[in-house]
């Protein structure tokens, strides 16, 4: 008689990434009997929650339940009912909530309590919501990409299973760009990590890793833009801000109260003789780049070398995966190819920023104007951050791989977070076992 497949013995996990600009829900799946193996967990679903980040609900917490409904119902559909009660759900909030907590711990707590109340009312094994630290965000992003790239596996392979695999066990560095913060994480080459705050020690699958990480709060792309506007309006002669980071012909009115709402602009705050000002785009990459550089204080460094703002950064080492907004922005600009040099990227950005706004709107008719208008700034910011902030060069640019997904799973901190909380990354290398025959009878 023919062999008959038994029902698959799988497990599921859910992680919600509550970012500054939006929330995404990720569903992961893995074979139950292989949970200590490397590379067996994969993403089966991503659901982007409609609306802003949870920190924006501070004055309307009663709307949080409805906000989360669609994606939680989607999770209910994707995961078999028999698995619901065993499926852990985690919510990690990042820099948007770190900023809200800086403004008011009480308001941040209220938002998290109501988020928890909403998520607790689903039939999953909800494990709570918390604001993760910048260090965790960096570390879990690094774990995610190296787990997916097979870097923790001790088996050497003669074939490559993923596009970026160099077939050695050298880990990739992780570059993460969000709306409110950015993280850089990598294993430096025989270099002492001079600042203890930036040092992480891991033992994963029987190997020790000394990892450098830093999260730059307020240097995500959205908060960096607010910083730049707050800095530039200080020296504007009137309520018109001629801005090189926006396309020629672009116009937008900004409320001064919105500009100073975030803690990220406090250092530039001043009493202005107007309540609103108008951004008028002039579309000049070089000037935009110069304006962005003024956000990075490179005049002070108490270590052998720094990134910016006096933060220690060891010499860059190895390949890097650049994901989240690094990827989304560069993908939109069609600049993610391995073959595109840094010089070519700069040239393309110069051309893109100089294009008139009306032309841009016509060319990208399907893209929301709010997002479309900011790609010139975001692309220029990415170049400035990587080159002047983190000290990549034209030569080392080729070591940056702009990554959206690896093996079907999104690059980002959520997978690493779940692997850690479900104890699926053992400190020691598991004993290799023969292939299981339990799948067929």
């Amino acid at each position: 008689t023919q062999n008959k497949a038994l029902p698959e013995n799988v497990k599921y996990g859910i992680v919600l990434d509550a970012g500054s600009s939006h929330t995404s829900l990720y569903i992961y799946k893995w074979p139950a009997e292989k949970e200590n193996d490397t590379g067996v967990v994969h993403q089966v679903e991503e659901c982007r929650v409609k609306g802003p980040g949870i920190s924006k609900f501070v004055q309307k917490v009663n709307e949080i339940g409805i906000y989360l409904t669609d994606c939680m119902e989607r999770a209910r559909e994707v995961i078999p009912r028999s698995q619901h009660q065993e499926t852990p759900v985690y919510l990690g909030a990042t820099a948007g909530m770190r900023l809200l907590r800086m403004e008011s711990e009480e308001l941040a707590d209220r938002v998290l309590d109501v988020v928890e109340r909403s998520l607790s009312n689903y039939p999953f094994d909800f494990q709570g919501a918390r604001i993760i630290t910048g260090q965790e965000e960096g570390a879990y992003g690094w774990i995610t990409i190296n787990y997916l790239l097979g870097k923790f596996s001790q088996k050497t392979r003669w074939f490559s299973i993923v596009p970026y695999e160099t077939n050695n066990q050298e880990t990739f560095g992780a570059l993460d760009l969000g709306g409110a913060s950015t993280q850089v994480t990598f294993v430096p080459q025989n270099q002492t990590i001079e600042s203890p705050d930036n040092a992480l020690q891991f033992r994963l699958y029987g190997k020790d890793y000394n990892v450098y990480t830093h999260s730059f709060l307020c240097y995500g792309k959205d908060q960096a833009l607010w910083q730049k506007l707050a800095k530039d309006i200080q020296v504007a002669s009137n309520e018109i801000l001629r801005d090189p980071c926006f396309h020629p012909g672009y116009k937008k009115v900004v409320n001064v109260s919105d500009l100073y709402k975030t803690p990220c602009t406090k250092r530039f705050e001043m009493t202005l003789p107007f309540q609103q000002f108008e951004i008028q785009g002039i579309g000049n990459y070089q000037q935009c780049h110069q304006s962005i550089l003024e956000l990075f204080n490179t005049s002070y460094c108490p270590y052998s070398q720094c990134a910016f703002n006096g933060i220690f950064l060891p010499p860059l080492q190895g390949d890097f995966g650049a994901f989240s907004a690094f990827y989304f922005v560069m993908k939109f600009l069609n600049l993610t190819s391995e073959k595109v040099s840094q010089e070519k990227v700069t040239e393309m950005m110069k051309k893109f920023c100089a294009q008139p706004w009306e032309e841009i709107k016509t060319s990208y008719a399907g893209v929301k104007e709010k997002y479309l208008s900011e790609y010139c700034f975001s692309g220029t910011y990415i170049l400035s951050l990587l080159l002047q902030g983190y000290h990549f060069t034209a030569d080392s640019w080729e070591h940056i791989h702009f990554i959206g997904k690896i093996q079907g799973s999104d690059a980002g901190w959520t997978l690493g977070y779940m692997l850690n909380l479900t104890n699926m990354i053992p400190a020691e290398q598991p004993l290799s076992t023969p292939l299981s025959h339990s799948t067929y009878v």
Partner: antibody, heavy 119, light 107 residues
């Protein structure tokens, strides 16, 4: 194991303030919310309010102006205060633990404390 | 406020009978319904959450179903120890509300 124990006066005079303490064990108030529910003699259950793990509260609007819920995590205690009581407030008062972190359904209930409002 | 109604205030059955206790919500509550059992002089005991998920330790003869506005608690084979009042509760929106209860008696 999980336990909740309500303690408070058995008799309260009209217009006075009713104070009840719920002492919990077997779980931490930093990890779970606690709800208050009451049951008038021979009647059904009526939800009063909740205190969530970080301390934020939600109340039944029908009683909102009259009561407050607070807690002391270190003492494992939740406090319930109902002002300006009338005979209508005569009931068994229960505290109950959220089944999940902050859920609105309850897996463990206290034994309840019977409160009579009478002069 | 969402009203929860239980059509039978009392049900009389024999040991071994199958019983269905119904609960109706005045508006859509999804599957955000819990069921409790209360024996005389005791606090309520949790049986079911999310309309159909049984708590561990609750006998398998208890099951829940329904979504939207109509919900049922079924006891597949009533035992003498099941004599109690059964309450449904919605937690779809505040204020949380309970049904008036259905008293289960043994003939």
């Amino acid at each position: 194991q999980v336990q909740l124990l309500e303690s408070g006066p058995e008799l309260v005079k009209p217009s006075a303030t009713l104070s009840i303490t719920c002492t919990v064990s077997g779980f931490s108030l930093t990890n779970y919310g606690v709800h208050w529910i009451r049951q008038a003699p021979g009647k059904g259950l009526e939800w009063l309010g909740v205190i969530l793990r970080r301390g934020s509260t939600d109340y039944n609007a029908a009683f909102m102006s009259r009561f407050t819920i607070s807690k002391d995590n270190s003492k494992n205690q939740v406090y319930f205060k109902l002002r300006s009581v009338t005979a209508e407030d005569t009931a068994v008062y229960y505290c109950a633990k959220t089944a999940v972190v902050a859920g609105d359904y309850f897996d463990y209930w206290g034994q309840g404390t019977m409160v009579t409002v009478s002069s | 406020d969402i009203q929860m109604t239980q059509s039978h205030s009392t049900l009389s059955l024999s040991v071994g009978d199958r019983v269905t206790i119904t609960c109706k919500a005045s508006q859509n509550v999804g599957t955000n319904v819990a069921w409790y059992q209360q024996k005389p002089g005791q606090p309520p005991k949790a049986l079911i959450y999310s309309a159909s998920y049984r708590y561990s330790g609750v006998p398998s003869r208890f099951s829940g179903s329904g979504s939207g506005t109509d919900f049922t608690l079924t006891i597949s084979s009533v035992q003498a120890e099941d004599v109690a009042v059964y309450y449904c509760q919605q937690y779809n929106s505040y204020p949380l509300t309970f049904g008036p209860g259905t008293k289960l008696e043994i003939k």
